[in-house]
């Protein structure tokens, strides 16, 4: 599998992974004890036909061209968890692995 | 996990799974011996904020609102394989499970 990595200076218009630091403090999300911020990344860019397609299915839908199918969009194709310490709804402190918090790769699907 | 199912008569505008039969014969993909057609399904519809979001990450990116982030799009969130019989590039007949050929659920990511 393969995905493009970009930064704020990139001129790449195609689907790409960009750096993004999520700052829980800035959001006012005080129930999150740690981390206060983390590198989440995000996906952005155009999905020209076949570029970075994750699934053969994406290609097949393009071929079949059904009503209302909008074509592939740039979305996470590989994600990873982070460990977090936070208060749950019952005000208990929880330490756990939260899935799909970091984008490792972007693709068209 | 939850996803909407629609059909061609549905008036649903939100992200939904629609039926789609992929016909390899109609594509002229004769290297595929079997099946000649299969139910693939596809995703289509709007992703209003928070509706059917697969990852907490999607919500966080929306909050952070970085340059160029287009918002979530309606994309497969659960897929399954099918068994296929086909010729490979060396003209050998291969029987195998091909991943991500059927959309089981759609969501916003």
């Amino acid at each position: 599998d393969f995905g493009l990595d970009c930064d704020e200076h990139s001129t790449e218009s195609r689907c790409c992974r960009y750096p993004l630091t999520v700052d829980f403090e800035a959001f006012g999300w005080d129930w999150i004890i740690a981390p206060k911020r983390y590198k989440a990344n995000y996906c952005s860019g155009e999905c020209e036909f076949v570029f970075l397609q994750k699934y053969p299915h994406t290609h097949l839908v393009h071929q079949a061209n059904p009503r209302g199918s909008a074509g592939p969009c740039c979305t996470p194709t590989k994600m990873s968890p982070i460990n977090m310490l936070y208060f749950n709804g019952k005000e208990q402190i929880i330490y756990g692995k939260i899935p799909a918090m970091v984008v490792d790769r972007c693709g068209c699907s | 996990d939850f996803g909407l199912d629609c059909d061609e008569h549905s008036t649903e505008s939100r992200c939904c799974r629609y039926p789609l039969t992929v016909d390899f014969e109609a594509f002229g993909w004769d290297w595929i011996i079997a099946p000649k057609r299969y139910k693939a399904n596809y995703c289509s519809g709007e992703c209003e904020f928070v509706f059917l979001q697969k990852y907490p990450h999607t919500h966080l990116v929306h909050q952070a609102n970085p340059r160029g982030s287009a918002g979530p799009c309606c994309t497969p969130t659960k897929m399954s394989p099918i068994n296929m019989l086909y010729f490979n590039g060396k003209e050998q007949i291969i029987y195998g499970k091909i991943p991500a050929m059927v959309v089981d659920r759609c969501g916003c990511s």
């Epitope: - | 595929i32 079997a34 019989l85 007949i93």
Partner: antibody, heavy 124, light 107 residues
């Protein structure tokens, strides 16, 4: 509808060759295996071999490897079988049949359509 | 090659009878067995595939059963049009091999 129409009866002398045809209609010819089967007078059925028209990949019964050659003409949706070095015991009706997959496993198929048969008579 | 032994080689029966034809493979063929009907001067016609599945358009008086090496074709109530020769075919392994046939005649 799906149809296989074979060429007419042939009479040949021993040592000669013959090429019989099977013209397909009503389906995508290139995407289905074509099989050939023979039946000597008053005898049972024998499998000769098959061919996949898309890429001409073929598979033969060893017994017929030196006897039969399977080819296709995609432009006319026609399968051919050439029989060489004919002998009197090659006198038989030769059938083409389409292999139809009901599933995806390598053996998940049956013959759904047969040609009407071509009688080849080898006589001096 | 897999040998297919069909029995009986001929069979006399009356209209309305129930008849059974058997086919024995020289090894396990994993239910990859088909049955055909052939009338004089005509091409074979597929009846049953995968041991017990009826081909579309074939009347339900025909049924197939069996597994491993042993298979049967049953015709539940013979009609005049059913008198013909019946063949089995194994498609588990190349080369494909047929049984020698069972000729079903009117008694």
């Amino acid at each position: 509808q799906v149809q296989l129409v074979q060429s007419g009866a042939e009479v040949k002398k021993p040592g000669a060759s013959v090429k019989i045809s099977c013209k397909a209609s009503g389906y995508s010819f290139t995407g289905y295996f074509m099989h050939w089967v023979r039946q000597a007078p008053g005898q049972g059925l024998e499998w000769i071999g098959n061919i996949y028209p898309y890429n001409s990949v073929s598979n033969y019964n060893q017994r017929f490897k030196a006897k039969a050659t399977l080819t296709v003409d995609k432009s006319t949706s026609t399968a051919y079988m050439e029989l060489r070095s004919l002998r009197s015991d090659d006198t038989a009706v030769y059938y083409c049949a389409r292999r139809y997959y009901y599933g995806t496993g390598p053996a998940d198929w049956y013959y759904d359509v047969w040609g009407q048969g071509t009688l080849v008579t080898v006589s001096s | 090659d897999i040998q297919m032994t069909q029995s009986p080689s001929s069979l006399s029966a009356s209209v309305g009878d129930r008849v059974t034809i058997t086919c024995k493979a020289s090894q396990d063929i994993n239910s990859y067995l088909s049955w055909f009907q052939q009338k004089p001067g005509k091409a074979p016609k597929s009846l049953i595939y995968r041991a017990n599945r009826l081909v579309d358009g074939v009347p339900s008086k025909f049924s197939g059963s069996g597994s491993g090496q042993d298979y049967t074709l049953t015709i539940s109530s013979l009609q005049p049009e059913d008198f013909a020769t019946y063949y089995c075919l194994q498609s588990d392994e190349f080369p494909l091999t047929f049984g020698q046939g069972t000729k079903l005649e009117i008694k």
